[in-house]
Amino acid sequence: SSPTSSASSFSSSAPFLASAVSAQPPLPDQCPALCECSEAARTVKCVNRNLTEVPTDLPAYVRNLFLTGNQLAVLPAGAFARRPPLAELAALNLSGSRLDEVRAGAFEHLPSLRQLDLSHNPLADLSPFAFSGSNASVSAPSPLVELILNHIVPPEDERQNRSFEGMVVAALLAGRALQGLRRLELASNHFLYLPRDVLAQLPSLRHLDLSNNSLVSLTYVSFRNLTHLESLHLEDNALKVLHNGTLAELQGLPHIRVFLDNNPWVCDCHMADMVTWLKETEVVQGKDRLTCAYPEKMRNRVLLELNSADLDCDPILPPSLQTS
């Protein structure tokens, strides 16, 4: 059998050793082929090895599993189900592994899984039951606390004939399994909108990252129930203005810090409330960096330096006076 590591180093398992014992039941502390293992750190790294499936012979002690930079393509149901189960596995990183399908129950039988990173995978098919494991209306609670789903949008030509936002949200809400989720990262996914019911059903969220999407408006999104929310990242979206209802909801959250940099703010008469709010609120981080993008005459003006006289709307001309 391959050696397990000392306290200070990782051991690598030679491929020929692994194949020599593959017909036998895996030894408890064996290190899979193409992986590095440290029992002291309870960590297994199978990184940038072009693996096409999850190793079957993961050591039972694994607490942190890195399977990044591989070519997994599909994560089937029970992809990590083992006998005995991987009862200690708490952090699983699958980023950049060319996953395009995650099936129902892919993460079942991982009772301690708290952190899951699926970032940088073109997920054309994310099952609604990927995280809940069953299609029951109320599933057993997932142990997940952190779910990292940055840049999981597939290329346009690979998307199914359905809303990508809808597919992701269905997986987040299925069976109410993620009620304990505290961190959710959804950056860089070309989201055009946020379905209105998603936040209401994730009441434990502390950190929500929606940066680098294409969100135009938050009018139909409610933050009111997110009483534990500490950080809300909305940088690098397509937001034009925040309206009174949203301002009041954000202002009322007891722990909140909001990040709004690099949005194309439209500085016309509809911006007056937001400017008034910005001048007094302490919840927006780096508010002195926010600038107008439109109209052209206002480009690069700092929002905090605007007054009501600057924020006008062109009168709507009656049809008889409009030119074609």
Epitope: Q251, P254, H255, R257, W277, E282, Q285, G286, K287, D288
Partner: antibody, heavy 122, light 111 residues
Framework: EVQLVESGGGLIQPGGSLRLSCAAS????????MSWVRQPPGKGLEWVGF??????????ENSASVKGRFTISRDNSKSTLYLQMNSLRAEDTAVYYC?????????????WGQGTLVTVSS | DIVLTQSPDSLAVSLGERATINCRAS??????????LQWYQQKPGQPPKLLIY???NVESGVPDRFSGSGSGTDFTLTISSLQAEDIAVYFC?????????FGGGTKVEIK
Amino acid sequence: EVQLVESGGGLIQPGGSLRLSCAASGFTFTDYYMSWVRQPPGKGLEWVGFIRNKGNGYTTENSASVKGRFTISRDNSKSTLYLQMNSLRAEDTAVYYCARYRGNPHYAMDYWGQGTLVTVSS
Amino acid sequence: DIVLTQSPDSLAVSLGERATINCRASESVEFYGTSFLQWYQQKPGQPPKLLIYGASNVESGVPDRFSGSGSGTDFTLTISSLQAEDIAVYFCQQSRKVPSTFGGGTKVEIK
């Protein structure tokens, strides 16, 4: 567990200077506004000022009664808040508390230290 | 500056009875739908302890006999059934505007 521990108080003559420290632990120091509040013996509470967090540039606000004499600063590498007090007067005699603002600073202070006594007397 | 006036200055209440403390602000402490008014409890030789934030939200770990109400300029702290350990001075504080200001305090004693 959030902990705030003040130090640096003592007896000082009018016109003198003193620097109070507040060592913070149990939270991400740079994320939070921090403040000083004082309480003269047997009297009520008076807000001295605050220093903003990293996201808002560590800028400060002070009460009118100490403006130009007291300076709030922070050493984020040491998770320590300071109050530099110059031109001290008898009316500055008080217990000085360091306090952490809630994540949304509009909701004011949720954790306080035990305080350090400053006595200004000749 | 916003001035907070607390009443009464002191209050004697029998154990198990209701205690009510008022705080009036010289101008509204409301901002975008939330009243930024807090209540603190202070016992001798101890720092203030946060009880209520945003006028009516009870801080985690605070017994549910404490409640806060009010909006705009008029606020109330209620102790529904006074216990011996509630003997303390209570302060209101506004954080709507800089400088933050405190009320003068109300001393609660046992009758």
